[in-house]
Amino acid sequence: MNGRVDYLVTEEEINLTRGPSGLGFNIVGGTDQQYVSNDSGIYVSRIKENGAAALDGRLQEGDKILSVNGQDLKNLLHQDAVDLFRNAGYAVSLRVQHRLQVQNGPIGHRGEGDPSG
């Protein structure tokens, strides 16, 4: 029997320095393009190889970005959020929410050679 899947939610402040092609990640979401049902928040869809975010190492695909330089990202159109990132300056402070998947409940022992392992 599988355990229940829960999420551990943490927040972190990440400071990035803009590179030649931006901050090194893509975003989805917004009031006009909900990425998560009933949530118009802005999410990281891709971390670009060798970009500023990848080199920093803390931002992850699937993270929710709560604010940029202290400016809340709630209830923004997708393009308005994009424009905030484009115009955020050289040194950018991001408040992000990580969701770490954790498994609760009974987890059966898997023997060696178990095909599900």
Partner: nanobody
């Protein structure tokens, strides 16, 4: 240094085909939402077709069923296969990328993209 260079345009008869290419340098193409845009003389620039970093695609109604966008990640090149060309497809065609948006529809509708090519002329006559 990010650079996009288009090629493949030309003069073609109505009903004919062309394949446009957009070679990227200075960045990895499949990390970006990127697309094809066109501007005819005296008209506003319009998004023709765009593709997200994860491969979702968007086509303007005027080209659906005739144009196909694709990406070769090995060659780091974006393509636009254009079939059944019409005189109204005559325009200067550009490729452009967004550094942030990964929503292909938003990219194609945006007038605020981050990297642009110089364009290649397509004339259908």
């Amino acid at each position: 240094h990010v650079q996009l260079v288009e090629s493949g345009g030309g003069l073609v008869q109505p009903g004919g085909s062309l394949r446009l290419s957009c070679a990227a340098s200075g960045f990895t193409l499949d990390d970006y939402a990127i697309g094809w845009f066109r501007q005819a003389p005296g008209k506003e620039r319009e998004g023709v077709s765009c593709i997200s970093s994860h491969g979702s695609t968007y086509y303007a109604d005027s080209v659906k069923g005739r144009f196909t966008i694709s990406r070769d990640n090995v060659k780091n090149t974006l393509y636009l296969q254009m079939n059944s060309l019409k005189p109204e497809d005559t325009a200067l065609y550009y490729c452009a990328a967004s550094y942030y948006s990964d929503y292909e529809v938003a990219v194609c509708r945006s007038d605020a993209l981050d990297a642009w090519g110089q364009g290649t002329q397509v004339t259908v006559s």
